[in-house]
Each structure stands twice: as C-alpha cells, then as structure tokens.
Interface confidence: low
C-alpha cells in the first residue's frame, strides 16, 4: 500500500512567494510621475515577477518631525487620493497581488518614532490599523523599531488589532540590527510578525559563515515561520559584492520562509550608480530613457526592458526562481537539512513528504570547486540520490533540465544551482 | 537582434562527410546552449541534441551517437554540426536552436538543407 | 522518452474561424511546454513557452492552455499569415521530444 500523505500544513498568502517593497513611489516609477495611479500600470510588472504582496509606502502626510502635520489617516496628495488607492487596491486584488501598506510615522524625518513622543504616535498607529484594515489593505509595515521605546509590547498589541481583524492580515516589523538575540526577543511576544532585519547581511560572505547564520537563525527562532532579506528596506547591491547577487536570488528564494525584496533587486539595481540621485531611493531603471538627464548613462543590460529579452539575465533568474518557489510544495513549506560540502559552499536540501524534492548547492569563492557533497549528516527522510536534474545555474551555459551526477559536480566560481530530485518510497 | 544564420545548402553523396555553420549574433553564444534539430522530408522535427557552449560539452541523443560530432569556435560566434560517412537516410534539413533553462529553443537558424545522393 | 501526441494531424478551417490544436504528454511534464510555428519556406519561430506564456512580439489571437496532461493551441480568429504547421516541444526531460505536428490549410 502506498504511504499516506503528510497532512500539508496551513498557508497563509505570504507563505506562497515573495514580498517586494516599494519605499518611494517616485523613484520607483521614475521622473515626475510618482503616483498612485501610475503605480496601477506597474501591477502587470509585479505579477510577472509572480510576487504575492507590494509593501508599499509610506504615503501618509508627514511633516518632517512634526507630530501634528503628520496623519496616517491621510494620503499624500503629491502621492494620490484615497480614491486612488482604493483603485489600486481593487486592481491587484484582480491580480492576485496583496498589499502591506507601511505606516512608519515620520518616514521624512530624523527619528522614524518622534522618540520623544510615543505615546501619541502609538495612538496614532492603532487609529490608522483600524482605519486601512477598514479600507482593504492585506497587512502593515512598521520601520526602525528599535528606535520605539517598548517595541515588543507596541508590535504585540497592532498584531493583537491586525490578526483580530482577520488572520489573513499580515504584520511586519523591520530593525536595522543585526543581533540575534535582539531580534528573537522581538519575536518572542509576537507570534505570527514577520520580521526583517540585517541580520545576513553581518557576513563575511562566506559558504561556511552564511551557513552558520542562517542555521543559527532558525535554531534560534524555532519552526516560527520567517521572513529571508539583507535589511529593512535597501537594495541588495548596497550590501553585497555583485559576483553574489544571482547567489543570493537562490538562495533567498529557497530558504524556509518568505523572501523580501526591494524594487530593484531584480534587475541589480544599484544606488546612487547614477549621478544625482538618492543613495536610499535610486531611480527604477524601466528602460534607456529612465534617466535622460544624462544621455548614455544607462546601458539595455541595465533595465527592465533590456533584461526582459535576455534569458540569461538577473530578471530573468529572479523570475524562474519566483516561479518555482511559488508552485513546488518542497520549496513553499518543505523541511530543510543542510549538510557538508566542500570549504566555500553552502548546501542544503528542501524537501516535502513524496513531492519532488530540491537541493541548493552555493558556491561562493572565487575559483572553480568540487561540490563534495556528503550526505551522511543527512537523516534518511532527506537522503541524496546519485543524480539530480538541473533546474537552473545561477551562471550561463548549463542546459535546464540535465542530469548532474552529483558525486562528481563541479561548480564554476560564485555559481548556485537548484537541482531536483524525485522521492522514492 | 538576435539571429542564427546557418550556412547553405550541401548536395553530397553517400560516404561523404558534411559540416554545417551556425552564426549567432546579437547574444553571447557561450550564454545559452546550442540544439540541433533533424527535419526529413514531408516529416516533423527530431532532436539530436545540444552542446554546453560554456564547457563545449556536446550530448547527442541515442540515434545520432557515432556519426555526428557538435563542435564549437566561440570567437567566431559559430557553432558546427559535422556528419561523416553519409547515408541516403541523412537527407534533411537541419537546424540550430539555442536554448538556456527553461528557454529553450527560442530562437532558430533558417535551416540547412542537406542532400545526400549517388 | 516522453511521448507527444498531436492532434488533429492536419486541419481545414476558414479566415476568422477559431481553431485548437491539441498535445497530449505521456509522463508528468509540468508545463514545460513550447508551441512553434514552421511557415511554407521551412522557417520556424517559438509561439509559446511554460505552456502558456506568450512570446513578445506574437500576436494575442494566439493563447496556450493546460489541462492535465493536455496542451492546446488556440488561435482565436484565423489569419492568412497562420497557415502553417505547429509543433509542440517538452522540454521538462532528455531527450527533447516534439509532437508529430498539425498542418493547418485554408479551406
């Protein structure tokens, strides 16, 4: 008889793909038509990066560092209506598309918490919870909460607002440290907050430390569900060497949790690359005409257009990734091994009661290595077989869908692969 | 843009050996693998296999194992498909593919028409 | 191998009508599917891929859907440019397989 299926565990929406944050509409859309209703032309975009949630914003009015001009009641008018937002509420609810407004309250100020006045801002946000849970919105997003006195207790009690109103919203909080322990005392008091941190981003970027810290992080947090990102809100360009960036598509993707990006990371958007702009919101690169102050500036390979017609692009890897992390029931919810592999790499295996099963192999030094898989401190559930099928390189020139024997795999310099496997009883 | 060219057609008789160009321009040709395709007369397409043009490792699927020989010469963009000791059965058109992960076979050369006869 | 079995064969239909073309997998191929078109001068040009994703560039009268096992092709209003043989192509295991291909005539 064959074995009963493994009882599949409860999805929420965010536990199916990837968030992608939209901090600056401006930015985002390019040169002078930062708005709403602009934005609503973007959606075909973000649904062919198969992402389940827009962290969008902030949008509300804020006067810098001042309590009083600030209300999280009310849009922007340099950003739209409400009108406008309720269309475009409506519009990616067509496309399948959630949205996690951020109400960090003084986003244009100094201190994201007007440190000296918490209270009244608390009050302010609970308000507005209520307010845009009214309105549609799928979650929130709060910022820099370890500038807010007593954060554990504030989170607890918008998760208390958010989760009463339904269990399908999602709360997410976003620090800029980088300390476990910090972090797990966070999400200790807050059951279901997904929190982003620069956590991965305190490496020395290699196979063996981002092991460690990502196994460390899960130990740390349980089987707490979990959110994988560089920070709060920056770019991955800022944090890591480009040779890394296609590495740490796959391997975001692929961890057990939700991946969380910024607008940009799909195409190695970098900030300030460009003169003139913003370190901390650079202008989207939708095609060569993106930037026209400066003729030239900006190559194909650079923008979303050009990236679009290169299979072979960084566009191109995060939308396979998407795709596969979004329909494979290893990679939405399967367990996780790692186990050893040669100096420099970082492996592990996904896998989900008779689904076909995945394995990651990350190379990231600087020359060419033996995979030297050795899966003897995998537990028989996880075992490797002798071969596994490519699913994609994160380098050129490997054929899709190949079968790799893995005793003998080699991997080029900074190269990830996916490959899969299938179960046998 | 993106273009295959393949070189022309070969009118050759059997015992003979032929080769076949394909040019790509306006990609990198060690970017994305290489397919070759067999199309006989009045019939549909056969895969004979593909070459890694990162490695120049060729696979050749079961039937056209012994006689035929994928080759490569990355600075010229080119890759070959040469077919020895030819039989009357090699009448056909053959054609370059490219293809990357799950893009495979997106663009393809016109075709080359081969004509083995005595 | 993984088997593709097209069908119709062949199939006579007017400007303007709709027609479908069907492709049915032998083994699990999970949407890795392309449609591609041969013209009368034998040249060939990819349609679809993913099953049912549309390359830039090809006109919106042509969709591809999955159902099971099965792959279609629907064109959705006939044009004297379409006459033309379609192939389906698995590319989800080696060796790469293609459907025996359907010609389509004007009536």
């Known amino acids: 008889r064959a074995p009963r299926c493994r009882e599949l565990p409860a999805q929420k929406w965010w536990h199916t793909g990837a968030l992608y944050r939209i901090g600056d509409l401006q930015a985002f859309q390019g040169h002078g038509s930062g708005n709403l209703a602009g934005l609503k032309g973007r959606l075909d975009y973000l649904s062919s990066l198969k992402v389940k949630g827009l962290v969008l914003g902030p949008l509300h009015k804020n006067q810098k560092d001042d309590v009083a001009q600030t209300d999280l009641l009310q849009i922007d008018p340099n950003f739209g209506s409400k009108e406008d937002f309720d269309n475009l509420l409506q519009s990616a609810k067509k496309k399948s598309i959630r949205v996690i407004l951020d109400l960090t309250p003084n986003y244009r100020g100094e201190n994201l918490w007007f440190s000296t006045q918490v209270d009244s801002v608390a009050t302010k946000v609970k308000d507005a919870l209520e307010f845009w849970l009214q309105a549609g919105v799928d979650g929130f997003q709060v910022r820099d909460i370890e500038n807010l006195k007593d954060a554990s207790s504030f989170l607890a009690e918008w998760e208390n607002i958010t989760k009463g109103f339904s269990e399908d919203r999602l709360l997410i909080a976003g620090t800029n440290s980088s300390d476990l322990q910090q972090i797990v005392s966070l999400l200790e008091s807050n059951k279901d907050l997904l929190l982003t941190s620069s956590y991965l981003s305190d490496s020395s970027f290699t196979g063996e430390h981002t092991k460690s810290l990502v196994t460390q992080y899960l130990n740390a947090t349980g089987n707490r569900w979990c959110s994988w990102s560089l920070s709060q809100a920056g770019l991955l360009t800022s944090f890591l060497p480009a040779q890394l960036l296609r590495l740490y598509q796959l391997m975001l993707f692929t961890l057990p949790g939700t991946p969380v990006f910024s607008y940009g990371d799909e195409i190695g958007l970098k900030a300030a690359a460009l003169p003139g702009q913003p370190v901390e919101a650079p202008v989207m690169l939708w095609d060569e005409s993106s930037f026209p102050d400066i003729p030239g500036a900006v190559s194909a390979n650079m923008t979303v257009k050009g990236q679009s017609e290169d299979p072979g692009s960084l566009l191109s890897l995060f939308r396979q990734l998407s795709d596969q992390r979004s329909k494979e029931r290893s990679l939405l919810h399967g367990d996780f091994h790692t186990f050893s592999s040669g100096p420099g790499l970082f492996s592990y295996i996904r896998h989900w009661d008779q689904n076909e099963r995945f394995l990651v192999v990350l190379n990231f030094g600087d020359v060419g290595l033996s995979a030297g898989l050795q899966a003897s401190d995998l537990p028989a559930s996880a075992s490797l077989p002798t071969k596994a099928d490519l699913v994609l390189s994160t380098q050129p020139g490997r054929e899709e869908g190949s079968p790799l024997e893995l005793e003998r795999l080699k991997l080029e310099p900074h190269e990830g692969l996916l490959l899969r496997f299938p179960y046998v009883a | 843009q993106i273009q295959l060219v393949q070189s022309g057609p070969e009118l050759k008789k059997p015992g003979e050996t032929v080769k076949i160009s394909c040019k790509a321009s306006g990609y990198s040709i060690t970017n994305f693998g290489m397919n070759w395709v067999k199309q006989a007369p009045g019939k549909g397409l056969k895969w004979m296999g593909w070459v890694n043009t990162y490695t120049g490792e060729p696979t050749y699927a079961d039937d056209f194992k012994g006689r035929f020989a994928f080759s490569l010469e990355t600075s010229a963009s080119t890759a070959s498909l040469q077919i020895n000791n030819l039989k009357n059965e090699d009448t056909a058109t053959y054609f370059c593919t490219r293809s990357v992960i799950t893009y495979t076979m997106d663009y393809w050369g016109q075709g080359t028409s081969v004509t083995v006869s005595s | 191998d993984i088997q593709l079995t097209q069908s119709p064969s062949s199939l006579s239909a007017s400007l303007g009508e709709r027609v479908s073309l069907t492709c049915r997998a032998s083994?699990?191929?999970?949407?890795?599917l392309s449609w591609l078109q041969q013209k009368p001068d034998g040249t060939i040009k990819r349609l679809i891929y993913a099953a049912s994703t549309l390359d830039s560039g090809v006109p919106k009268r042509f969709s591809g859907s999955r159902s099971g096992s099965d792959y279609s092709l629907t064109i959705s209003s006939l044009e004297s440019e379409d006459f033309a043989d379609y192939y389906c192509l698995q590319y989800a295991s080696y060796p790469r397989t293609f459907g025996g291909g359907t010609k389509v005539e004007i009536k």
């Open positions: 083994q699990e191929i999970s949407g890795y």
